[in-house]
């Protein structure tokens, strides 16, 4: 029958080559000569020439050693033709299966494998997986079946069997308790992979197991007791640096310290921060300390880590005795800013007020006073009593020195400490208005026609405050009323000036007396230019003449 069962050929055959494998045979060879040929990869197509056939005998030949890891199976076709080249059989499948020899050692996928595990983990914790490959067959034979083992462990602390490896998966696990990063931070395992499921060729690699830090060490104060001296009133002042030691991995959350003031800071005067490099606790003042109130503070500070402890650990506490040092403190005006009402224009030498300061220091210190800033030079201050007296005329209407009726003065108090200290206070004099200004018209120059003249409206201003202002009253004096009229409007804040008789073109003085609600009178001369014109006019030429 024109069929051929699969041919099994071991790889790496020694020959001699060509080697006869099997014979192609057609039963159509009775009475006719048959010629055989083969086609397919390994015969007439790449890899060419691995197999050949004797054309007349049909012997299938192997021309060279085979390599299963290169090609594990060849699929060829056998052909039979008669002398005239005509096919006498359909192409026949020829399967050549290359059987495996253990001709490859296992190979680890890396020379060095790296893994990590937390210190203190329980036995059974998986660390890492290593892999070795073997090109040989692992399905039908054990040639490519790899078994893993640990050959050695360095260091051998706390003992030489800290890890195990799963023989078939290559998973490395912790087998013993006692992994302590602070004692052994890294283990080097020499691992083996052996084919034939452990009975064949062996290869080695290295597995480096890094022991990761867990927060299993508390930070400890060293020293635990501190004494510090701080000047009173200093804010943000560094009081003391507290030093701790921690066996955990530097600069990790398990090492970085967190400080807490547990007691002794009832007034919330202190704060403590962690120095980013040294890990020290920096105790500073949040508020100024007061020697006179409390000259010593005893603080209790506890230290933990940024990371929580992985097991119950005692916390370390430090005691800091802070001695507050007395400082000569400046006198303080009471109140710091004093408002006093005083009538403007009071006589020179008249007392304005007494403005004194208190000294926070316990000793009885003498305080002396002086004026630091008095822009108008209106005041004087007694150095012993703090009595403020008028030495100039206080003028509410002085726009250079008075703002919104207030005149601002800065005073100074100086103690007799060593060295002396000074404090300042602000005296705000609210000036009460008196009727010391009469009404003034605006403008004081007018131009008017001598025929059908337009009435001239003048605004009235008074620097004083109500009730020393409007309504105003107007009166013409010095015979100005012969030619002119002056009337105050209903609101009493403007005066209307009119020409009642013809005057020739010239410039005239009009004598206008205005008085305020408090009858304060002010005489003003209005310069009136009369023009030869009708109605409204802006300017006209002409000589000046008194009227």
């Amino acid at each position: 029958e024109w069929v051929m069962p699969p041919i099994f050929v071991p790889e790496n055959g020694k020959g001699p080559f060509p080697q006869r494998l099997n014979q192609l045979k057609s039963n159509k060879d009775r009475g006719t000569k048959i010629f055989y040929s083969i086609t397919g990869p390994g015969a007439d197509s790449p890899p060419e020439g691995v197999f050949a056939v004797e054309k007349e005998t049909g012997w299938l030949l192997l021309n060279k050693p085979l390599d299963r890891e290169e090609i594990a199976k060849y699929e060829l076709f056998g052909h039979a033709v008669s002398e005239n080249g005509a096919s006498v059989e359909d192409p026949m499948n020829i399967s050549i299966i290359v059987t495996d020899q253990n001709d490859h050692k296992p190979k680890f996928t890396q020379d060095t494998f790296r893994g990590s595990v937390l210190e203190g983990v329980l036995p059974g914790t998986s660390v890492m997986q290593v892999t070795a490959t073997d090109e040989d067959d692992a399905i039908y034979t054990y040639n490519g079946v790899v078994a893993y083992s640990i050959h050695s462990q360095e260091p051998k602390d706390p003992h030489d069997l800290m890890f195990t490896i799963h023989r078939s998966t290559g998973t490395i696990s912790v087998i013993s308790s006692g992994l302590d990063r602070e004692k052994v931070p890294e283990y080097t395992l020499t691992i083996q992979a052996t084919d034939m499921d452990g009975d064949g060729s062996t290869t080695t690699a290295v597995a480096v197991v890094e022991i990761l830090d867990a927060n299993d060490n508390a930070p400890m104060f060293d020293p635990q007791k501190y004494e510090a001296h701080v000047p009173e009133n200093a804010v943000g002042h560094e009081v003391q640096r507290l030093t701790v030691t921690d066996l955990d991995a530097p600069n990790s959350p398990a090492w970085r310290a967190t400080y807490l003031i547990m007691g002794g800071d009832d007034g919330d005067h202190f704060t403590i921060t962690t120095h980013p490099e040294s890990n020290q606790g920096i105790l500073t003042t949040r508020k100024g300390l007061d020697f006179e109130a409390k000259n010593q503070h005893t603080l209790y500070v506890e230290v933990t880590n940024e990371a929580p402890f992985v097991l119950k650990l005692p916390t370390s506490t430090a005691t800091i005795v802070v001695h507050v040092e007395d400082v000569n403190e400046a006198p303080v005006f009471v109140p710091p800013s004093k408002v006093v009402e005083v009538q403007e224009g009071i006589p020179t030498g008249e007392p304005v007020c007494v403005y004194t300061a208190e000294d926070p220091d316990k000793e009885n210190q003498k305080i002396s006073y002086r004026i630091l800033r008095d822009p108008a030079g209106w005041l004087a201050m007694d150095p012993d009593s703090g009595q403020v007296t008028a030495v100039g005329t206080l003028d509410r209407e002085d726009e250079q020195f008075v703002r919104n009726n207030i005149y601002e003065v800065m005073v100074l108090a100086m103690d007799n400490g060593s060295p002396p200290t000074t404090g300042t206070g602000t005296l705000l004099l609210t000036l009460i208005d008196v009727n010391d200004h009469g009404p003034v018209p605006e403008p004081r120059q007018i131009t008017i026609c001598n025929q059908s003249p337009v009435r001239q409206v003048l605004n009235i201003t008074d620097k004083d405050l109500s009730p020393h202002t409007s309504p105003f009253q107007a009166q013409l004096t010095d015979d100005s009323d012969i030619y002119w009229t002056a009337e105050v409007n209903e609101e009493g804040d403007t005066v209307v000036l009119s020409l009642k008789k013809f005057l020739k073109q010239d410039t005239y003085d009009v004598h206008l007396s205005l008085s305020d609600h408090g009858n304060k009178e002010q005489l003003t001369v209005i310069r009136a230019t009369v023009c030869d014109c009708h109605g409204h006019v802006e300017t006209c030429p002409g000589p000046w003449k008194g009227g």
């Epitope: 060509p18 000569k33 010629f35 050949a52 007349e56 030949l61 002398e83 080249g85």
Partner: antibody, heavy 121, light 107 residues
Framework: VQLVEESGPELVKPGASVKISCKAS????????MNWVKQRPGKGLEWIGR????????KYNGKFKGKATLTADKSSSTAYMQLSSLTSEDSAVYFC??????????????WGQGTSVTVSS | ELVMTQSPASLSASVGETVTITCRAS??????LAWYQQKQGKSPQLLVY???TLAEGVPSRFSGSGSGTQFSLKINSLQPEDFGTYYC?????????FGAGTKLEIK
Amino acid sequence: VQLVEESGPELVKPGASVKISCKASGYAFSSSWMNWVKQRPGKGLEWIGRIYPGDGETKYNGKFKGKATLTADKSSSTAYMQLSSLTSEDSAVYFCARQRDYGALYAMDYWGQGTSVTVSS
Amino acid sequence: ELVMTQSPASLSASVGETVTITCRASDDIYSYLAWYQQKQGKSPQLLVYNAKTLAEGVPSRFSGSGSGTQFSLKINSLQPEDFGTYYCQNHYVTPFTFGAGTKLEIK
């Protein structure tokens, strides 16, 4: 075993064709491969192709495909090679050489005396 | 295609001397290498096949060796009739390829 290339020296014009013969005797002609080899004056040997007279199977060097055509006549135990579209590059001595069939891995053990072909106008 | 590199290209030796010619294949041809001798105006003659098997009638002073890609032909005690050109040939895969030849001359 004897291989006789019966055609004497050939002088042919460019573009023409020539057919060289090789008569075998002293062995089973049908059961061995017949190879053809080219040798240009003063140069080395170059394999053209081969034919198995039994069933007419041929194998060519890619360089000579379309240039050489191999045939065999079993009745006269003669192998032929026709060269077409000749150019001066085809001027050479052409040898026939037997190769026994053992998966065709035997070397060429008997050679003809060679036929000289000169291409010239 | 396979490239066969022969060395030396030419060689001068005296009768009675021993000479060695080498041949390198560009790929593995196992033991499928033949050596031929060709004299001026004659056809090539097979000396060795399968790298070390002497062809019928070839004197035993000729010997072939090698496998894979490196091969050599050694001629002990050179005789006057041994002078000519020697070729190596791959008889593993087609196209069969020859070396460029080594010309052996009398010194």
